[in-house]
């Protein structure tokens, strides 16, 4: 394969550009990302020497994707800052393949390839140097060049210590063998994001799990902060594409946003979809369930294709607090399917969130303990209590006459009506349980329009000597 | 010392092209991208497009789409601009900008400007 | 396309006064805020780079500043080959778009 591939580079023509020549590596010293042309080629140790590359220091290739400007765009320019802040001493190479990349995207992919083995060739040479290791490597590839950083680590000789894929390109490359695309098998650790993936029409980033760790941020698909809603107001995008380009280069910014916040780490968590996690169910740290995302995010012992969780901000810092809430409904009267609005408003120590919607996935279980995922953006310290609001619904005259009839011959008990006896909640980020109990037992119902308060009860779940409380069915 | 030179004014008749040359010294010439740019009399200035001369790749504002055409030869280290079917709107000072091959790079230096006017 | 406004076209002012030139863009653009100086005989200069970076050469009176959609350029103590146009302009999305200008002129 690889000398069919070298008669490829030898024989290529894109435009004006040999494809051979086609590849740069641009070595960004930390004296500050306008620096230009400090540029590494296969056998010329000179520029090593000239621009001071650090052999036994951590070395990241950064590699672009598919371009329509023929320029590379601020995304890179910020990752490489990111990166050189973060990490004094390590070296930064920017892979510029852009003589390929600015072509027709069937083309691009078509020269990924090509592009891998040439990052190889490099990777090869520099191991011939003393103290350079290809586990101190890390390949970091958004949209195609997450490919091309595959096809790298497949070619090199040796295991290169990580391959990072920012939400790595779709087309073309969803659902073909792992030779194909970006797989496990091509670094010691591969961890992806993915941010912009849809089930209808063209996903332009991969959906499937490519590597040991896949990270789904708001379900991998409809980004907070890039919707046509903030988009038409301007605020940061203006058109239909800008929209995609923002879901696609959040990849990116979440990947920055863990390197510079350090001290706002965000975590995933490892569940089967997203709508499970969306249900709450899935915010375990137990057997290495959960993950730091991005640079924090850890290797762990035979995970493959894991795939990851979280809800993230809108904008940097990215992180969130994620809470399950598990409520028992009890129904005293059979009410049928009902589809109640629930708010909740958390109370900590340190502050009070802002007014969350419980997420009904599927429907209300009555009679049943169901689960739900909240998030906050501000960290609320230790919960103190929380406020559960049923918003009331506008119903038919027809529902009204009812609940007024069932009133007349059950004055105590509106049709309509709910008993919580206590909300059960984790915090994901500290693992922590607690129980939150109304302050009157015999005040447990809710109905529409109305709202009940619950203080915290006990650290943990369990209760003591717990009953249920009779169910009247009617 | 980078320097742009550019070629001297230009006075031309409506529907004529007119082709602006830009050579590049002091540096590298493919480790950099050339950006034109124009400037009406009076007015502000306007990015036209740029090209990069490793590759040849080219990307121009839509506006100008149909206007100009940029080419380079490295040989000479020379970056062209091609302006084809002129007006009077084109009428102006015509500048090439060295700028790194980062978006965010500056245009951190620029040609001394062609002038060009296009009359009957 | 971002829209760039330096909304004070003409600017007098006298040698060794301090000046401040304001520019707006239509949305954020991320401190990719350049500088330029034009003088009357066409000539034009880089000053200042990603909103507050010097452009090696360019004395140390010019300052930039700025986040999100506002930015400005402060020349303290002007001397006389200052009086010039000055120029902001947008990195952070094609098309590359400039303001108006600014003519600083002497008092």
């Known amino acids: 394969a690889e000398e069919q591939l070298e008669g490829g580079l030898r024989t290529a023509k894109d435009g004006p550009a040999a494809a051979k020549a086609a590849v740069r590596f641009h070595f960004r010293t930390s004296k500050g990302p306008e620096r230009e042309g400090c540029y590494l080629s296969v056998g010329h140790s000179q520029p090593l020497e000239d621009c001071s590359f650090n052999m036994t220091a951590k070395t990241f290739f950064i590699i672009h994707g598919w371009t329509m400007s023929g320029m590379l765009e601020n995304w890179l320019h910020k990752l490489v800052s990111a990166l050189q802040m973060r990490e004094k001493d390590a070296n930064v190479v920017v892979v510029d393949w852009l003589p390929l990349a600015h072509q027709l995207y069937t083309d691009a992919v078509n020269s990924t390839r090509v592009v891998g083995l040439s990052v190889a060739k490099m990777l090869d040479w520099l191991q011939g140097k003393d103290g350079f290791s290809l586990g101190n490597v890390h390949l970091i590839g958004y949209s195609l060049g997450a490919h091309v950083a595959g096809f790298a680590g497949n070619f090199v000789k040796g295991t290169v210590g990580r391959i990072t894929g920012l939400d790595p390109a779709g087309p073309m490359f969803e659902g073909v063998d792992i030779h194909r695309r970006l797989s496990p098998d091509d670094a010691d650790f591969v961890d992806v994001l993915h941010t912009y993936t849809r089930s209808f029409g063209i996903s332009i980033g991969i959906q499937m799990p490519v590597g040991h760790i896949d990270i789904y941020p708001n379900g991998g698909d409809f980004q907070p902060g890039c919707g046509l809603n903030d988009v038409l107001g301007s605020i940061a995008y203006g058109t239909i594409a800008e929209v995609v380009k923002c879901e696609h280069e959040r990849a990116v910014h979440l990947f920055v946003d863990s390197l510079v916040n350090q001290d706002k780490p965000s975590f995933a968590f490892q569940c089967t979809d997203s709508n499970r996690f969306k249900k709450g169910i899935c915010l375990s740290c137990r057997k290495n369930r959960c993950n730091g995302i991005g640079y924090n995010a850890k290797k762990t012992r035979n995970k493959r294709n894991t795939k990851m969780y979280l809800k993230t901000r809108a904008g940097m810092p990215f992180r969130v607090y994620h809470y399950q809430m598990k409520i028992h409904f009890f129904s005293y009267k059979s009410v049928g399917a009902i589809e109640p609005t629930f708010y909740v408003t958390l109370y900590g120590t340190n502050a009070e969130s802002q007014v969350l919607s419980l997420e009904i996935v599927e429907q209300i279980g009555l009679n049943a303990t169901n689960t739900f995922l909240v998030y906050t953006e501000e960290d609320l310290g230790d919960l103190l209590k929380i406020k559960l609001t049923w918003e009331g619904t506008s119903r038919s005259w027809y529902d009204l006459w009812r609940e007024f009839r069932s009133y007349l011959s059950q004055p105590h008990r509106p049709e309509r009506e709910l008993s919580i006896r206590r909300i059960r909640v984790k915090s994901g980020e500290t693992q922590r349980r607690l129980t939150f109990c109304v302050e009157d037992p015999e005040k447990t119902s809710i109905a529409p329009g109305q709202e009940l308060w619950f203080y915290k009860c006990r650290d943990g779940w369990r209760m003591k000597n717990e009953t249920s409380p009779t169910v009247e069915l009617s | 010392e980078v320097q742009l030179q550019q070629s001297g004014p230009e006075l031309l008749k409506p529907g004529a092209s007119v082709k602006i040359s830009c050579k590049a010294s002091?540096?590298?010439?493919?480790?950099?991208?050339i950006h034109w740019v124009k400037q009406s009399h009076g007015k502000s200035l306007e990015w036209i497009g740029h090209?990069?001369?490793?590759?040849?790749?080219?990307n121009n504002n839509e506006k100008f789409k149909d206007k100009a055409t940029l080419t380079v030869d490295k040989s000479s280290s020379t970056a062209y601009m091609e302006l084809r079917s002129l007006t009077s709107e084109d009428s102006a000072i015509y500048y090439c900008?060295?700028?790194?091959?980062?978006?965010?790079?500056?245009?951190?230096?620029w040609g001394q400007g062609t002038t060009l006017t296009v009359s009957s | 396309d971002i829209q760039m406004t330096q909304t004070t076209s003409s600017l007098s002012a006298s040698l060794g006064d301090r000046v401040t030139i304001s520019c707006r863009a239509s949305?954020?653009?991320?401190?990719?805020l350049n500088w330029y100086q034009q003088k009357p005989d066409g000539t034009v200069k880089l000053l200042i780079s990603y909103t507050s970076k010097l452009h090696s050469g360019v004395p140390s009176r010019f300052s930039g500043s700025g986040s999100g959609t506002d930015y400005s350029l402060t020349i303290s103590n002007l001397e006389r080959e200052d009086f010039a146009t000055y120029f902001c302009q947008q990195g952070n999305t094609l098309p590359f778009t400039f303001g108006s200008g600014t003519n600083l002129e002497i008092k």
């Open positions: 900008a060295r700028k790194g091959i980062y978006y965010s790079s500056p245009f951190d230096y």
């Open positions: 002091g540096y590298t010439f493919t480790d950099n991208t």
């Open positions: 949305q954020d653009i991320n401190n990719y």
């Open positions: 090209i990069n001369p490793y590759y040849g790749g080219t």
